[in-house]
Interface confidence: medium
């Protein structure tokens, strides 16, 4: 019979012969022959192959390096790679999440509008009139000025976007 020029799905052509590909999670040990099937072996502990293949080496699972702020989101299997994500308080620098950066701080006069997530950075907003922030923080919102009236006090010093109002006792003297 004529040697094949193309093979079925999940097969590959070698030495004018169609051999079965190894299934995901296994690597090729030896090609098939006229008399033997393709020989495959499972990937090792920290290895994977995610397709039908004829690879002689499995790929190493990705390492989620804690020194880069990374942690394991999903542990790899013999058929899937490990998925990394950022530790709390950090976010990915790219879609591939190869490293993480600390969330950006909002300077005094600005508060956190939205705390950062694992994929997006802090969103800061200027403190509007009536609110202030005297800290540099990636987490703190603008705080409302103290209400002197509710404490039966009067404003001695006006507040700003960076400072609270200063309250003082009411002047008891009447003209």
């Amino acid at each position: 019979p004529e040697p094949p020029t193309a093979c079925r799905e999940k097969q590959y052509l070698i030495n004018s012969q169609c051999c079965s590909l190894c299934q995901p999670g296994q690597k090729l040990v030896s090609d098939c022959t006229e008399f033997t099937e393709t020989e495959c072996l499972p990937c090792g502990e920290s290895e994977f192959l995610d397709t039908w293949n004829r690879e002689t080496h499995c790929h190493q699972h990705k390492y989620c390096d804690p020194n880069l702020g990374l942690r394991v989101q999903q542990k790899g299997t013999s058929e899937t790679d490990t998925i990394c994500t950022c530790e709390e308080g950090w976010h990915c620098t790219s879609e591939a999440c190869e490293s993480c950066v600390l969330h950006r701080s909002c300077s005094p006069g600005f508060g956190v509008k939205q705390i950062a997530t694992g994929v997006s950075d802090t969103i800061c907003e200027p403190c509007p009139v009536g609110f202030f922030s005297n800290v540099s923080s990636a987490f703190e919102k603008c705080h409302p000025w103290t209400s002197c009236e509710t404490k039966d006090l009067v404003v001695q010093q006006a507040g700003t976007n960076k400072t609270d109002v200063v309250c003082g006792p009411q002047d008891r003297l009447r003209a």
């Epitope: 880069l68 702020g69 600390l102 701080s105 705390i115 005297n134 540099s136 923080s137 703190e140």
Partner: nanobody, 121 residues
């Protein structure tokens, strides 16, 4: 000049507890988020925990979550790390660090000299 001085480290058995302190000076302590980082022998810096300026928000690395507690006393300019159920892999030099003002990949603006925690039987 920013100064951070850690204390409270020592030798402890697995399962034991320690409380680390960090005394801060040279800046308005209450005006910054703070954090603890650590460096195990022969390894790089690893982030441990962050606390917001007011102490309301706290964050932990997965490796210490449920065992370590970060806190602060702004009136005393002091940061704390309560470490319970200690494991051999917690052995490291622990540093307190002022949270950077900008993006930073393990580049902590200011950190102290560290205190060594050894967990061994």
């Amino acid at each position: 000049e920013v100064q951070l001085l850690e204390s409270g480290g020592g030798l402890v058995q697995p399962g034991g507890s320690l409380r680390l302190s960090c005394s801060a000076s040279g800046f308005t302590f209450s005006g910054y988020d703070m954090q603890w980082v650590r460096q195990a022998p022969g390894k790089g810096l690893e982030w441990v925990s962050t606390i917001s300026a007011s102490g309301v928000y706290t964050y932990y690395a997965d490796s210490v979550k449920g065992r370590f507690t970060i806190s602060r006393d702004n009136s005393k300019n002091t940061l704390y790390l309560q470490m319970n159920s200690l494991r051999a892999e917690d052995t490291a030099v622990y540093y307190c660090a002022k949270y950077p003002n900008r993006f930073a990949l393990n580049s902590f603006d200011y950190r102290g000299r560290g205190t060594l925690v050894t967990v061994s039987s």
